[in-house]
């Protein structure tokens, strides 16, 4: 059964030409997370498994950079880059939980952070 | 359509070298790890070497550790094994595939293999 | 010698089920993925089961994984004649970091 919940940075929006830290928490589970999957709509971004390491799809690489964690780090901004993002923990035994993330690039210099919320 | 191709198996005598290749297409090479697994006469699969996505993280067999090496170059979407201190217990039918996204979950496709004897 | 455990062959007639096992141990079955293969003579193997118990698009429904402690089993109900093959099971090893096979079980479709 699956008793986890993940946690995410929730909808946040950030400065064209900056940086953003998109982040996951999986809790209330004591189940191995085997791999991290990041991916934007339907594209990879990134995969983040406990064997192998880290790896930046080939399209993204200049732009996109591992971590803090199991997060990822998103970099020079455009406004193209506004959309959902999925974290997706394929864990043993539970199975795979799914976090969203919706991150809004704006031009201007206003750029306030969401609150955090929770995916069951 | 997905596809990989091996090529370069032949007639080597024992303690010579060879390098296998294995060509893909139809897909994001670098998104995928990648495996080799040989198949002897009349016996059954046995996983030989394992690549991760930019070839920093390599696993081998114990059969083959210290002889064989893998590699890949993504810039031209393929995958080597390079053989050395060839036996007679390596003759086989070498094929090399590709993992799963989430790299413990299978392997999902095959070549149609390449024939390596070994004998003097 | 195969680090996992598959009994040399197994047979059934038309339309009967018949299951295959694959016993492992606590490093790789009972912590990890297992998946399945199909190989018929003088060709490839092909993916029937990944991740213990799903089936990729296009591998009929009569296939099934299924995954209990250190044992995982693959299902065939409906047997056809096409179906007499070798099939392998596999898993990744935590402790020995490694791709382990099974021996291979040789179905024969009587």
């Known amino acids: 059964m699956m008793t986890g919940t993940i946690e995410t940075t929730g909808n946040i929006s950030a400065e064209k030409g900056g940086s953003i830290i998109l982040q996951c928490h999986l809790s209330s589970t004591t189940a191995q997370v085997t791999q991290v999957n990041w991916e934007q709509q339907d594209q990879l971004l990134a995969i983040c498994n406990a064997d192998l390491g880290w790896h930046i799809s080939p399209s993204f690489k200049d732009r996109v950079a591992p971590g803090p964690g199991l997060g990822l780090t998103l970099q020079s901004l455009t406004v193209n880059d506004t959309g959902e993002y999925f974290c997706i923990y394929h864990t043993y035994p539970d199975g795979t939980y799914t976090g969203r993330i919706f991150l809004e690039v704006l031009e201007s210099s206003v750029a306030e952070h969401g609150a955090r919320f929770q995916i069951p | 359509e997905v596809q990989l191709l091996e090529l370069g198996g032949s007639l080597v005598q024992p303690g010579g070298s060879l390098r296998l290749s294995c060509a893909a297409s139809?897909?994001?090479?670098?998104?995928?790890?990648m495996s080799w697994v040989r198949q002897a006469p009349g016996k059954g699969l046995e996983w030989v070497s394992l690549i991760n996505w930019n070839g920093d993280k390599t696993y081998y067999a114990d059969s083959v550790k210290g002889r064989f090496t893998i590699s890949r170059d993504n810039s031209k979407n393929t995958l080597y094994l390079q053989m050395n201190s060839l036996r007679a217990e390596d003759t086989a039918v070498y094929y090399c595939a590709r993992h799963w996204i989430v790299f413990q979950y299978g392997l999902d496709v095959w070549g149609q293999g390449t024939t390596v004897t070994v004998s003097s | 010698q195969s680090v996992l455990t598959q009994p040399l062959s197994a047979s059934g007639t038309p339309g009967q089920k018949v299951t295959i096992s694959c016993s492992g141990v606590s490093s790789n079955i009972e912590i990890k993925y297992v998946s399945w293969y199909q190989q018929l003579p003088g060709t490839a193997p092909k993916l029937l089961i990944y991740n213990s118990h799903q089936r990729p698009s296009g591998v009929p429904d009569r296939f099934s994984g299924s995954k209990s402690g250190t044992s995982a089993s693959l299902a065939i109900s409906g047997l056809q004649s096409e179906d007499e093959a070798d099939y392998y099971c596999t898993s990744w090893d935590d402790r020995l970091k490694s791709w382990v096979f099974g021996g291979g079980t040789k179905l024969t479709v009587l």
């Open positions: 139809g897909f994001t090479f670098d998104d995928y790890v």
